[in-house]
Amino acid sequence: EEELQVIQPDKSVLVAAGETATLRCTATSLIPVGPIQWFRGAGPGRELIYNQKEGHFPRVTTVSDLTKRNNMDFSIRIGNITPADAGTYYCVKFRKGSPDDVEFKSGAGTELSVRAKPSAPVVSGPAARATPQHTVSFTCESHGFSPRDITLKWFKNGNELSDFQTNVDPVGESVSYSIHSTAKVVLTREDVHSQVICEVAHVTLQGDPLRGTANLSETIRVPPTLEVTQQPVRAENQVNVTCQVRKFYPQRLQLTWLENGNVSRTETASTVTENKDGTYNWMSWLLVNVSAHRDDVKLTCQVEHDGQPAVSKSHDLKVSAHPKEQGSNTAAENTGSNERNIY
């Protein structure tokens, strides 16, 4: 009678993470008597996957009933496959012996490859806000995919970016991989509504590439432009001075009026108007009773935007032509501007 052969018909098996792998193995004879064992890897460091005789292998089930006397099918199923299960699996026939069974013959091995989807890309921007014309860095990360081949692209408002560096780790063989990419983006004043997108494509993805996004509204700071103007006289001895605060982002802004260097009023931007580009406009006015001043008045509109050093614009108010009165009466009002962006 011909000597027993262990047949593993599949040179390689490909399985998706989370699925079940079937590893096929048949013997050509019932003799010699003895159990089958499955190992991952070869040599002294091999890992026992299944032992027909003894042990507890919760993820492994046999395809056929190994207790039947004439059974020659020793195929197994391994459930809930992860990338860590990748490797070459050997079906090994043992001959019954005393005290221990003796390895008799091994199959040629089946290489199990696992395909795993990349995680959703996570895009993160700089910790601090930056102003237009500055270059900021964004990072994109995705993990857990296999095989290693992956493509990553960056977009800003649909336009592909070219200034980025990407690494896939580890460099050598691994059960699964991660990708890390850093893109450089130059900010413009119009970027409040802009988005940076990281797009990852992989063989496992049946849909479009996975996307991670970052809104530049969380990154950009557009400093305001100031304009102080004197309006026509409202009434005898009263002058209306306005401070137009234009094209700023984010909204966090505090305005202080100074009369000859002395704080007259401080207010926080509330009823702002939004421009099409996402920046804001705001207007504050100060009603000055010129009769309270003997000399010319230097009015200063001082703005502290988003915690940055204050910027200011001044206006000299001539009072010499007005009749002088005793006492001081300075009133200030604030209103939101109804006008749209004029730039």
Epitope: K11, T151, Q206, G207, D208
Partner: antibody, heavy 116, light 109 residues
Framework: VQLVESGGRLVQPGTPLTLSCTVS????????MGWFRQAPGKGLEYIGI?????SPYYASWVNGRFTISKTSTTMDLKMNSLRSEDTATYFC?????????????WGPGTLVTVSS | DIVMTQTPSSVEAAVGGTVTIKCQAG??????LAWYQQKPGQRPKLLIY???TLESGVPSRFKGSGSGTDYTLTISDLESADAATYYC???????????FGGGTEVVVK
């Protein structure tokens, strides 16, 4: 799991034609689908795919002449201004469950003949 | 686009014999290669994917191997039912595009 192409017929050059691929046994929202063609006595040629989410991608030679779209149970190939060299059997196919690198289910094909 | 060069264009072998078909990609395709069998008037049938993985139900007489740019389909213990045209198909993970080889007609004597 089944794919069946329809719409193939004899048309004159310059005529538009739309082919359909009707699927059963699975959802088009779960798989990438592709269109291929085979001229008489020639090899297989890739036309384009549509992703599970409905985005089409085309072979570089297509140049806007063909459009792939889908509904819940059918995938269409709209062909503009057909030429005699478009005469072929057109196949639809589904990618495998493990990845988009191979096609494991094919339709029987539908014949398009472009001739005056 | 990647060009797939398949050789030979035709091969003849006897029943019980072995046939080897080669496919060379214009650049590395990282084992993203499938083999199909097509008989006259029929649809293509997937045999092997990811260079060496046998599709369910396909006899183990069909064996795929190779990596990088060079791939091989070996059919052993030829049967008359194996008479068909065989195509290789690549997928390029960067361009996300597909390409076919020109086909190999296998004649079984």
């Amino acid at each position: 799991v089944q794919l069946v192409e329809s719409g193939g017929r004899l048309v004159q050059p310059g005529t538009p034609l739309t082919l359909s691929c009707t699927v059963s046994g699975f959802s088009l929202s779960s798989y990438v689908m592709g269109w291929f063609r085979q001229a008489p006595g020639k090899g297989l040629e890739y036309i384009g795919i549509i992703s599970s989410s409905g985005s089409p991608y085309y072979a570089s030679w297509v140049n806007g002449r063909f459009t792939i779209s889908k509904t819940s149970t059918t995938m269409d190939l709209k062909m503009n201004s057909l030429r005699s060299e478009d005469t072929a059997t057109y196949f639809c196919a589904r990618v495998g469950p493990l990845g988009v690198d191979y096609f494991n289910i094919w339709g029987p094909g539908t014949l398009v003949t472009v001739s005056s | 686009d990647i060009v797939m060069t398949q050789t030979p264009s035709s091969v003849e072998a006897a029943v019980g014999g072995t046939v080897t078909i080669k496919c060379q990609a214009g650049q590395s395709i990282n084992s993203y290669l499938a083999w199909y069998q097509q008989k006259p008037g029929q649809r293509p049938k997937l045999l092997i994917y990811y260079a060496s993985t046998l599709e369910s139900g396909v006899p183990s007489r069909f064996k795929g191997s190779g990596s990088g740019t060079d791939y091989t389909l070996t059919i052993s213990d030829l049967e008359s039912a194996d008479a068909a045209t065989y195509y290789c198909q690549s997928w390029h993970y960067i361009s996300r595009s597909y390409a076919f080889g020109g086909g190999t007609e296998v004649v079984v004597k």
